[in-house]
Amino acid sequence: PRSIDVKYIGVKSAYVSYDVQKRTIYLNITNTLNITNNNYYSVEVENITAQVQFAKTVIGKARLNNITHIGPLDMKQIDYTVPTVIAEEMSYMYDFCTLISIKVHNIVLMMQVTVTTTYFGHSEQISQERYQYVDCGRNTTYQLGQSEYLNVLQPQQ
């Protein structure tokens, strides 16, 4: 195994709000990540950067700094939240997400995350990309893995 393994687990929760006038959707998406340190020494996770894409457009970004250190042969589960905005040229989604006649308003989002660890002045970056279903019509908490979209093009890391 590589010295540090990063596994994107899935969406933990999605909290939604709307701006009726602007026909804008605000989604606060909390994701879960497992970082495993296969080394004999402990490592420092310097930062986690994440972005969310909808229809190939970046709709949200987040960065966490000085996250944690992980002991040897240890694994840490980290939650991080990405605030996203679906607006402007994608405001047509407002109608779909607020449609009362349907119960689940799932949209497919691409979650990208990069974990940076620092080794004596040089950085190692490990990235993951996963497609996930998120309900844009209501606040939702997910069982881990429940929001998984068919990641045919994304081999398991």
């Epitope: 010295s3 080394n39 004999y40 020494y41 402990s42 490592v43 420092e44 250190h69 002991g71 040897p72 042969l73 240890d74 694994m75 080794y119 004596f120």
Partner: antibody, heavy 122, light 112 residues
């Protein structure tokens, strides 16, 4: 002072299991790794595996084909090695040792237990 | 697995002599942080092994300065400048860079 006190000698039947303990004292148990080493009579040393008592994370010598299972009990500062499906080739002295680590570096096995003799015989 | 080849298997010496033990690894044992984790242990009859040298050349606390370690890449050496009676026993090199970690076969330091 730092001590690793291992359990006493065992005489066991082929096909059975045995659990060897290694009780740590004189240091913060979860801040060090515990390694296990095998020595057959008149032979050299063979690395079995390692456990991080803080997390329970382990690495094993795959050549031993699942022979050993390493665990640790933080509340009693004790590491354990369970050996299963014992045969005559498992007759050996088993040592535990501690290894320190830090950010991006680690140290050597500076303190060792006295060894536990396991004899497999019918 | 990384094979650690120690020579000689037996090293007869007189007290006060210099002694040199070689340890050769079958591949580089540089760890992913740039350090080489090559260690030397001494085991006396009926005792647990004791740490002498770590990271190729660093003497463990309490180890006399007549012991020195050197080497890089795949070739490593333990030298004892003036052998004393308490130095007798079996010396093992040990690599901690590739799982499974492996010991050399041992070198028995004995009186001529």
């Amino acid at each position: 002072q730092v001590q690793l006190q291992q359990s006493g000698a065992e005489l066991v039947r082929p096909g059975t299991s045995v659990k060897v303990s290694c009780k740590a004292s004189g240091y913060a148990f979860t801040n060090y790794l515990i390694e296990w080493v095998k020595q057959r009579p008149g032979q050299g040393l063979e690395w079995i595996g390692v456990i991080n008592p803080g997390s329970g994370g382990t690495k094993y010598n795959e050549k031993l084909k699942g022979k050993a299972t390493l665990t640790a009990d933080k509340s009693s500062s004790t590491a354990y090695m369970q050996l299963s499906s014992l045969t005559s080739v498992d007759s050996a002295v088993y040592f535990c040792a501690r290894r320190g680590y830090t950010i991006y570096d680690f140290y050597a096995m500076d303190y060792w237990g006295q060894g536990t003799s396991v004899t497999v015989s019918s | 697995d990384v094979l650690m080849t120690q020579t000689p298997l037996s090293l007869p010496v007189s007290l006060g002599d210099h002694a040199s033990i070689s340890c050769r690894s079958s591949q580089s044992i540089v760890y992913n942080n740039g350090n080489t984790y090559l260690e030397w242990y001494l085991q006396k009859p009926g005792q647990s092994p004791k740490l002498l040298i770590y990271k190729v050349s660093n003497r463990f606390s309490g180890v006399p300065d007549r012991f020195s370690g050197s080497g890089s890449g795949t070739d490593f050496t333990l030298k004892i400048s003036r052998v004393e009676a308490e130095d007798l026993g079996v010396y093992y090199c040990f690599q901690v860079s590739h799982v499974p970690f492996t010991f050399g076969s041992g070198t028995k330091l004995e009186i001529k």
